[in-house]
Amino acid sequence: YDFTNCDFQKIEADYLRTISKDLITYMSGTKSTDFNNTVSCSNRPHCLTEIQSLTFNPTPRCASLAKEMFARKTKATLALWCPGYSETQINATQAMKKRRKRKVTTNKCLEQVSQLLGLWRRFIRTLLKKQ
């Protein structure tokens, strides 16, 4: 999906209002400095591409983030403010339901959510401190 035509201001507002709080709750008891940055993004559409990938694509060491509250809200926000996004996600959602499994929060999932927080921080920072 190409995130170029999303309403970035509305997504930022949703993130600050709800998604950020859910991410921080998930990370409770963990310092952001516990994990090094292993993923970055270079503009707002790129940030959303990487956020979608980390949130919804299961990895061998962390398979279950898509069912978390922050992931549900992320999905709803993208569907609301990115034209045509929800249609592209139907097949992916059906495939995910088939492999649904209850999870335990592993250190690798905490690391992945720490990376997500970093990506969202870059997304809401429209400019570097200086040019």
């Epitope: 940055n37 292993t38 993923v39 970055s40 993004c41 270079s42 503009n43 790129h46 990487e50 870059r122 920072r125 400019l127 570097l128 401190k129 200086k130 040019q131």
Partner: antibody
Amino acid sequence: QMQLVESGGGVVQPGRSLRLSCAASGFTFRTYGMHWVRQAPGKGLEWVAVVWYDGSYTHYADSVKGRFTITRDNSKNTLNLQMNSLRAEDTAVYYCARSPQWEEIFEAMDIWGQGTMVTVSS
Amino acid sequence: SYVLTQPPSVSVAPGQTARITCGGNNIGSKSVHWYQQKPGQAPVLVVYDDSDRPSWIPERFSGSNSGNTATLTISRGEAGDEADYYCQIWDSSSSLVVFGGGTKLTVLG
């Protein structure tokens, strides 16, 4: 852990070519800008080139423009530097380094490789 | 093109504060990064965006930037701080990375 490993250095005659490679691991390579920086024996750091996270744009130092080409293969997590028409003054340790980028701005180089030595001599 | 000027050498007594400067035209409008390089090793980022510090760097390292001078400050200097230090900026107007010439820090004694 996050790592960059350079290879391909060696001794080469003036006017010849050499290709350096940098293998990345431990991070999502496709999301970072990547640089080559060199250091001549006993001298300071000299920036050589940078390639955007997606390979779409490149920038070069004037001293290597037209002779060196920086490329990346995000499917293989590798960075390359093709060096043509080599000169004695290109003798240096060559480092690859990653940096986050925001739009056209490159940020600090937070991870560096250990370097590979290139000697241009007849 | 943009030029960054550093003193070739700075000395500090153990336990004292070292300040390494990096001069450039209106450098305060740019983000400055600092690297430490020990002999035979690759550079290591110690301060980025003027004054931020990577999580693995001790609090003794700090930075500031205004006007025409950026400064790296190393408090309570230790023998292990002996190294070359380089400032660096991204020059947006020319799309080039610029490094300072480097400063050799010597810890006396």
